[in-house]
């Protein structure tokens, strides 16, 4: 079998064997090495020599295999836009941001750029659980049978109705989607004359 070409090598069809780690350089019509994450091109390749890479300076990064001549500047998460940091910037990864608690992403351009307050869910409903927190605004769904939620809130969850008998009480009024069961002390036992079967 033929030995694998090592960059730089000529490419007549403008494609390279390893698309992730190599790129086509049109001036010289050759395939050259990309620089690994955390680095940038310090010297371009030529027909005779390969790309030279250098490490990104502090507070800058490149996330992917690249042929960039600069590193990207690290940017902080903007609290004015409702964002908070979950992981700091490194030479290989930009600052990781998310929406602050109680907020959702309202503007998305490859990443979240602006968060807004989550809408309240009215009594009798709760926010549908999402795979990713802060991804979208609340979608309110009714409490399921046997549960209630009695506030207007972006985050309150439906709770199960109280079972009066578990507390040695009896139900005075049944629970609804918006209110809990009302319990009271059990009634005094009936007088003897009222006991037994009543015949008409």
């Amino acid at each position: 079998s033929q030995p694998q070409a090592v960059p730089p090598y000529a490419s007549e069809n403008q494609t390279c064997r390893d698309q992730e780690k190599e790129y086509y350089e049109p001036q010289h019509r050759i395939c050259c090495s990309r620089c690994p994450p955390g680095t940038y091109v310090s010297a371009k390749c030529s027909r005779i020599r390969d790309t030279v890479c250098a490490t990104c300076a502090e507070n800058s990064y490149n996330e992917h295999w690249n042929y960039l001549t600069i590193c990207q500047l690290c940017r902080p998460c903007d609290p004015v836009m409702g964002l908070e940091e979950i992981a700091p910037c490194t030479s290989k990864r930009k600052t990781q941001c998310r929406c602050q608690p109680g907020m959702f992403c309202a503007a998305w351009a490859l990443e979240c750029t602006h968060c807004e307050l989550l809408s309240d869910c009215p009594p009798g409903t709760e926010a549908e659980l999402k795979d990713e927190v802060g991804k979208g605004n609340n979608h309110c769904v009714p409490c399921k049978a046997g549960h209630f939620q009695n506030t207007s809130s972006p985050s309150a969850r439906c709770q199960p109705h109280t079972r009066c008998e578990n507390q040695g009480l009896v139900e005075a009024a049944p629970g609804t989607a918006q209110s809990d069961t009302t319990c009271k002390n059990p009634l005094e036992p009936l007088p003897p004359e009222m006991s037994g079967t009543m015949l008409m």
Epitope: R29, V41, A43, K44, C45, R47, I48, V52, A54
Partner: antibody, heavy 120, light 107 residues
Framework: QVQLQESGPGRVKPSQTLSLTCTVS??????????WSWIRQHPGKVLEWIGY???????YYNPSLKSRVTISVDTSKNQLSLKLNSVNAADTAVYYC????????????WGQGALVTVSS | DLQLTQSPSSLSASVGDRVTITCRAS??????LNWYQQKPGKAPKLLIY???SLQSGVPSRFSGSGSGTDFTLTISSLQPEDFETYYC?????????FGQGTRLEIK
């Protein structure tokens, strides 16, 4: 305007090591993606590429000299150096340092040259 | 290694003449050919790169052409300071190699 100036002993004994330095002025040796090269010209006027180096430490050598040559860059002194081991009479030449533009393989700035004679 | 052969080895001409120097490569090198001028006791000076591109500061009477294996350096109207030695150099493959030189003399 970039200027290059070679310096070193004009005479080296056979089997010893030839050492030359090239001082770069008018520009930083670690800027612009440049490579820095050594080329020699034998008494018969034939030019021979020795090799070149980048400030990062990346080097490329002529295979005919690779086993004997070391080229390095000292960014703190803005200098390029050449070491050629086990010299003989055939290494007698004028040694030039030169700059190689980013992404190219020609020489746009040259030093004035340093004659090195190998003899006992 | 890739060989470059210059012709002629020496050339006699007069001021005002148009002269052509040839460089032939032992294999195709696209347009990866460069030309230098060297004065006695001085370093070579880059005139033309990539076969036909004029280096900054070089007079326009110098021009280069060619592709593949055959290249020419032309001086359209010789000046007294042009009577020097000229070298071609290939930058197509390692190792970099030079032609043996063409010496231009006053007739």
């Amino acid at each position: 305007q970039v200027q290059l100036q070679e310096s070193g002993p004009g005479r080296v004994k056979p089997s010893q090591t030839l050492s030359l330095t090239c001082t770069v002025s008018g520009g930083s040796i670690n800027s612009g993606g440049y490579f820095w090269s050594w080329i020699r010209q034998h008494p018969g006027k034939v030019l021979e590429w020795i090799g070149y180096s980048h400030y990062s430490g990346t080097t490329y050598y002529n295979p005919s000299l690779k086993s004997r040559v070391t080229i390095s860059v000292d960014t703190s002194k803005n200098q390029l150096s050449l070491k050629l081991n086990s010299v003989n009479a055939a290494d007698t030449a004028v040694y030039y340092c030169a700059r190689v533009p980013d992404g190219e393989d020609y020489f746009d700035y040259w030093g004035q040259g340093a004659l090195v004679t190998v003899s006992s | 290694d890739l060989q470059l052969t210059q012709s002629p080895s020496s050339l006699s001409a007069s001021v005002g003449d148009r002269v052509t120097i040839t460089c032939r490569a032992s294999q195709t090198i696209s347009s990866y050919l460069n030309w230098y001028q060297q004065k006695p006791g001085k370093a070579p000076k880059l005139l033309i790169y990539d076969a036909s591109s004029l280096q900054s500061g070089v007079p326009s009477r110098f021009s280069g052409s060619g592709s593949g294996t055959d290249f020419t350096l032309t001086i359209s109207s010789l000046q007294p300071e042009d009577f020097e030695t000229y070298y071609c150099q290939q930058s197509f493959s390692a190792p970099i190699t030079f032609g043996q030189g063409t010496r231009l003399e006053i007739k």
